[in-house]
Amino acid sequence: WELTILHTNDVHSRLEQTSEDSSKCVNASRCMGGVARLFTKVQQIRRAEPNVLLLDAGDQYQGTIWFTVYKGAEVAHFMNALRYDAMALGNHEFDNGVEGLIEPLLKEAKFPILSANIKAKGPLASQISGLYLPYKVLPVGDEVVGIVGYTSKETPFLSNPGTNLVFEDEITALQPEVDKLKTLNVNKIIALGHSGFETDKLIAQKVRGVDVVVGGHSNTFLYTGNPPSKEVPAGKYPFIVTSDDGRKVPVVQAYAFGKYLGYLKIEFDERGNVISSHGNPILLNSSIPEDPSIKADINKWRIKLDNYSTQELGKTIVYLDGSSQSCRFRECNMGNLICDAMINNNLRHADEMFWNHVSMCILNGGGIRSPIDERNNGTITWENLAAVLPFGGTFDLVQLKGSTLKKAFEHSVHRYGQSTGEFLQVGGIHVVYDLSRKPGDRVVKLDVLCTKCRVPSYDPLKMDEIYKVILPNFLANGGDGFQMIKDELLRHDSGDQDINVVSTYISKMKVIYPAVEGRIKFS
């Protein structure tokens, strides 16, 4: 019996087609992805093949103005239109709290939404009961297939799930649910979830009875043969893991942003064992037509976005200096504003020992592309912020050793004075440079804000300590020459859309007046 699994993950509100790098589509003839194009390809495959499942491995939420405005209603609407068969909850599905998941998505989705390792307690337990499930048994042709969901156990540090959801260890939570499916005589089981490729592989290895793992979170690109675009494969598609009980378990992921549609063909024997598996992600490039009816619907929904862009988010009573003359040479108040917003967006009261799990921010000055003049009645709009942060990136959470941070700050000024983009703006960090010293030895003082303290204060950076830092995904990926970050990071979790982080902060503060306050000094 053959099953075709079509899968997406980490779409991050890319409902419209995008450029090849998943930013805003500029030249339509070169654009990719988007739900209208995805629908065309899905319909083609459904038409051609008998047993097809369309699955999403989480993180539909967060990433463009679509999510900012529609808050998840767009996800439910268009996933319903595409007739998804199931979705796993990702960490970003909790970005607007549990209410922001329940109302727009859980109550509106016409497909099951899954996670076996999220357990509700207290008053939430009854409110959310039945709105998401640990697993779902789906009829496919003459057979049944069990889908069991999972979500990153790090979600409380990455999003806002509140205090009434417990995120258990994935493997521990999955095994009893898979066992339950087995007792229901379901012998074909897919683990669909959002914990990253390393955890996906562990699930394939450790959870008895899982036949296929469809993952997300790490934006992993797998491909067999010559890859069709810029993404470099992390391995073959499917990636085969030998389980502890000796089975060959295919593990797949389909990069991110709706650029590819994962296509996996599985052949099962009559006892539900995987005989063979093959496939590849399908690049959704512009040679695949956008479905006119879905496209028309997108255009209808778009109207509200255009109106939103020009509405006031808040006011500034000071000039927001985002000029390259400032931000690439010295501390600039736009950099301070953005870093403060980044930390504010990551406030998660961890426990009595820590006032927060992260206190530090770094931001390449070259990523700040425009100032905002306060003389326009102080008004700040999304449109203004899009000029400051035009690249559609994310502000991510990483873990780095102190020694890596020191290297990053040395890199920040290694060729100081040439108006290059690597000069770092900061939050929760006090740095002093001595430019008379040779490159690679210019950082004379580097103090960082404590997290394990009731009254935050600045302490010298410790080389062997592991620190959490918020930074742009551009830096996490080694951009602007920060190869040491990419090479030495110990953990990387993708965060929220950059503009969204700053706009939320400004809306919350209502009136802002960031200053230049001595975060960066020259001796």
């Epitope: 690049l283 490039n285 006119p292």
Partner: antibody
């Protein structure tokens, strides 16, 4: 290399049936669709229907329902089209053509050489 | 059914000329349009798919453009071997339909 080899010319009586064949080679037969196209002498092209050999799913032009039946034999990588209740209107060249539904080339990328059917008493 | 209309049944041109053939769909077909060349006694050959993508090995003098309902096929510099009938076809909805064809004649 990809080839679609069609059966030879057919002469048939009105009211009879014929079965045309299209043997595929050079690619995985079950991973593509196969369409059949009719062309009367000096006329344009008309799509009859398509079959997906992997699933056996068939789709027909309403105009040819009851006239044409599409089948495929996976073991020999051969697609067939049976035409029944033949009339002189069925006299034409019939092409099979491949369709890559997993790729992005929206069109028929390989065609057979065509089979000429003549219906005459 | 979607009707594909090629307004010119015949077009006369000279070697080296630029020639454009138009095709109009009766409803929005996005970019799901292919163009074929058929020479006498031969099967059709795919030249352009998805409205503007040149198929493997097709000379770059052949181009396609358009989306929605209006499509154009262009030969930038006609060669003697381009004498043929050219068909547009929509691949958006079944039944897939072809235009009536445009016969390119060399003066």
């Amino acid at each position: 290399q990809v080839q679609l080899q069609q059966s030879g010319a057919e002469l048939a009586r009105p009211g009879a049936s014929v079965k045309l064949s299209c043997r595929a080679s050079g690619y995985t037969f079950t991973s593509y669709g196969l369409s059949w196209v009719k062309q009367r002498t000096g006329q344009g092209l008309e799509w009859i229907g398509e079959i997906y050999p992997g699933s056996g799913n068939t789709y027909y032009n309403e105009k040819f329902k009851g006239k044409a039946t599409l089948t495929a034999d996976k073991s020999s990588s051969t697609a067939y089209m049976e035409l029944r209740s033949l009339t002189s209107e069925d006299s034409a060249v019939y092409f099979c053509a491949r369709y890559d539904y997993l790729g992005s080339s929206y069109g028929f990328d390989y065609w057979g050489q065509g089979t000429t059917l003549t219906v005459s008493s | 059914d979607i009707v594909m209309t090629q307004s010119h049944k015949f077009m006369s041109t000279s070697v080296g000329d630029r020639v454009s053939i138009t095709c109009k769909a009766s409803q929005d077909v996005s970019t799901a349009v292919a163009w074929y060349q058929q020479k006498p006694g031969q099967s059709p050959k795919l030249l352009i798919y998805s409205a503007s993508y040149r198929y493997n090995g097709v000379p770059d003098r052949f181009t396609g453009s358009g989306s929605g309902t209006d499509f154009t096929f262009t030969i930038s510099s006609v060669q003697a071997e381009d004498l043929a009938v050219y068909y547009c076809q929509q691949h958006y909805n079944t039944p897939y339909t072809f235009g009536g064809g445009t016969k390119l004649e060399i003066k």
